[in-house]
Every structure is written in C-alpha cells, then in structure tokens.
Interface confidence: medium
Amino acid sequence: EVEKTACPSGKKAREIDESLIFYKKWELEACVDAALLATQMDRVNAIPFTYEQLDVLKHKLDELYPQGYPESVIQHLGYLFLKMSPEDIRKWNVTSLETLKALLEVNKGHEMSPQVATLIDRFVKGRGQLDKDTLDTLTAFYPGYLCSLSPEELSSVPPSSIWAVRPQDLDTCDPRQLDVLYPKARLAFQNMNGSEYFVKIQSFLGGAPTEDLKALSQQNVSMDLATFMKLRTDAVLPLTVAEVQKLLGPHVEGLKAEERHRPVRDWILRQRQDDLDTLGLGLQGGIPNGYLVLDLSMQEALS
C-alpha cells in the first residue's frame, strides 16, 4: 500500500506526459489525479512506465472505479491490462469487439493467460452467444480457442459462425467437441456443391455419423488418410470394404500403413477377409471365410 503523502510543490500533473517517468511511486500516487488518468489513458501506452509505476496507476484507477472500470478506460488499458487480475476483470462489462481486440493485442504472442480467459468469458457471456465476428477475432489470436471450450459451451455457437473456423482451429479438438460442431458445420455448408462442401466439412468429420460417411462415399471425395484416421471408430465400423474404397479413392493404399492403428485396426476386424483381399493391399485380420457374423448390437436393439 502506497502511503498518502502531499504532492510536492510544482509537481502536480496537469496532463499524462513523459515527465511522469521521473516521478517516484509516492509522487505518482500523490500528484496524478485519477480522473485525469482515466480521461488520458490512451497516453499511457506511449510512455515507457516501469512495472512498478504501472502498479501505482492501476491502484489509482481501482480507487476511482471500485465497481469496475468503464469501457472507455478498458479500451485504452494497453500494457496495464497485464496488471489486472481475473477478479478485476470479472467486474467489467465489455461489449465492444474493438475493446476485446485491443486487449488481446496486448497479450499477442503469449499463451492464453487467466486474465485473457476471464476477459473472453465475460465478453461471450455478455453477448449471449459466440457470433461469427467474435469467433473470427478469437481464433485469429488463439487458433486453439474453439477446442478449449466444453461441449456445453460449444452448443452456443450458431451455425453461421462456423464459416469463421479454419482447419487449424480444430487441431486439438476431441471427439466430444467435434460431435457438437459437426452438425452445425453440416447445416452451415448445406447449400454448397459436392467438392466445395467436402473441402469445408472435412476438418469437422471427426463428429460425423456412419450414414453421412456412407453418403460421402458416393461422391468421389477422395478423403485423405489423415482425415480418415480422425473419424469416430463407431462411425467407421459399419462401413463396407466397398464404401471405404470409394471414400478414400486413390488414398485407399494408405490403409496398409495404418492397419495396426484405430479406427483401421478395428474396422479390419469387422470385415470379411475375402472382401479385404479384393483391395489387394495384403490387409490381414479380417473374419475368415465361412464364419457367420452376428451383429449383437442389432440383436440387443431388437430385444
């Protein structure tokens, strides 16, 4: 806590300017009016204050706005934002995308900090949903942002926002997240023609059900192995050898290299060996000829 001391004669700050960097902490506290600081926050970023001096400036703003800073001040916080705690940020009401961008800029090049996470949470909750412009902004700064959300949080993403999502934004998403995002993507891209549709939907296919994969196999899409390996195992298992061959097109040869990995391994175990042999890839582990296959899951469903 900085002691309350009188401002020395002639040192009262009339504006936020560079002379203040020569002020000691107690002089800043005593000689800078908080209201003046609030109205000239945009100048603070242009002055190389030390971290200790920024602490004093933050303290002055905290005293002036105990209930939380107004957006006019928040927008110009600059490096002072790094001094804010999540508790400070929870008091804010940030509604402008420009304010959000300005603060994300300050943290650019760093991992998402607890302050940033809190800021984003406040902003999204204030908006009610993760709209396209917000998602555009957040994924530009943090490509992994989407995959950091829970399936429940992702459910508030409107299908129209899916257009802002780039393939790299989904790199760290797990199947539960893709399960939520895939139907939204399907809806968003539904009016596109075959090849364009596949390009857009490809990175979301980790959430696709069997029937959609079967439909894609009829469209000459030539899915690459990397995409195939990210498909849900339960969605791949019911596919026939012919359907997988059509789905992968020329990439079908890649199955040999992946035969020990899921979902290829589990799929092979479900296929008749003579069907696998038609691929000419030497895939082994299928059901020997003459064996009867009982689909127990279907039996359970009927009972």
Epitope: S19, I21, P48, T50, G78
Partner: antibody
C-alpha cells in the same frame, strides 16, 4: 500539429565541435523527451541521447559519453546537441525526435567532418 | 549493451504479407519491453509506424501490425504496396540504462 525544425548543414574540421539546434512549435515542449539520433551515409540509425526540458537532465548513450552535450531552452522551445572532438566518422545526418516513441522527427542536419 | 538483430533485406510481391523480425536478448526484448518500428524512405526522416510493441499511431495504415514473442519482436505488413518499399528499423527502450537501441535496419523490396 507539432513540428521540429533543425538548423542548417555544417562543414567542420576534425577536432572541432558542432552545435545543432532543434526548435519545436505547435505543442508542449517542456514535458516531453527530445532525443538525438544520427545516421551515417548508407548506415543505420544510432541513438545518441535525450533530455526532458522540464528536468534539464540529459541521458547519453555510452558510446558518446563525454563527447556529446544535450541541452534545452524552455523559453524558446529549442533543444541543442553539441558534439566535440569531431572525426571523419562523425559525418552523418543528425536528427532530433520527440517523445520516447520518436513520433515526430526534425528534417535532419547534415554534418560533414572533413579536413 | 543491448543489441537488436534484423534481417538485412526482405522482399515480397504486391498484395502479399511480409514479416520483419527483430531479435534481442532476454534482458532487452524479454518480458515487458518497449519496442517501436520506423519506416524510412531514401533521403527522408524516419516515420513512427508502431510503438510499445503493437500500437499504431493515428494515420498509420492498419496493414502494419506489431507483435512480440519471447525475445523476438515482429513487424508484419499485409497487402504489400509499392510505397511500402523502404528501410525499416526496430528500436527498444532499455529500462536499466534508460537507453534506446536501434536494430541494424531491414531493406524491404516490393517486387
């Protein structure tokens, strides 16, 4: 709109001194830094030192310590840079610039050191 | 003394994006550092393009942006235009010595 206007070109002999002026107009002078930066022909920028006129205290780059003197006259809103013991490698364009951000620059003063 | 290293030259075609790096040591560009970028056309005084890592002065196109990661600051110019051809300098303010140091400069050529 703040403007910085510098004095004219100078030709000096090795071993002598040169004093370049920088007059500010159209804005606050006293509470903002005035820095001096030089640029030798075909070379990069080199910071020499700065002063906040209201404080009168100047800060110099180690390389120029003892050879450069930066002063300011608040009454005329003018800053000065004096460089002594000139040598041929001091031939350069000398700029004054305002604030720590160098947001406004003077037009530059060419100082030629030649025997 | 702090030293900032920039590539001597970079080039790009109109419409492209280019990035100029400025690398220092942990003492000058690590943590909280005060990095600025300047553009200089031949025979002209330098012009401030970015200050305090990523702030743009009014009047500077939003095609110019700054960032910093670890000990490296970067200036990115998107939608490259012929008039962007110039020399670019980074600078850093050292809190310990109160000195400012410039990088060696990068010549940008627009092909």
């Amino acid at each position: 709109q703040v403007q910085l206007v510098q004095s004219g070109a100078e030709v000096k002999k090795p071993g002598s001194s040169v004093k370049v002026s920088c007059k500010a107009s159209g804005g606050t002078f006293s509470n903002y830094t005035i820095s001096w930066v030089r640029q030798a022909p075909g070379q990069g920028l080199e910071w020499m030192g700065n002063i906040i006129p209201a404080f009168g205290y100047a800060n110099y780059a180690q390389k120029f310590q003892g050879r450069v003197t930066i002063t300011a006259d608040e009454s005329t809103s003018t800053a000065y840079m004096e460089l002594s013991s000139l040598r041929s490698e001091d031939t350069a364009v000398y700029y004054c610039a305002r604030k720590f951000t160098f947001d406004v620059w003077g037009q530059g003063t060419l100082v030629t050191v030649s025997s | 003394d702090i030293a900032l290293t920039q590539p001597a030259s970079v080039s790009g075609s109109p419409g492209q994006s280019i990035t100029i790096s400025c690398t220092g040591t942990s003492s000058d560009l690590g943590g909280y550092s005060y990095v600025s970028w300047y553009q200089q056309h031949p025979g002209k005084a330098p012009k401030l393009m970015i200050y305090n890592v990523n702030n743009r002065p009014s009047g500077v196109s939003n095609r110019f942006s700054g960032s910093k990661s670890g000990n490296t600051a970067s200036l990115t110019i998107s939608g490259l235009q012929a008039e962007d051809e110039a020399d670019y300098y980074c600078s850093s303010y050292d809190y310990v010595s109160s000195d400012t140091v410039f990088g060696g400069g990068t010549k940008l050529t627009v092909l």
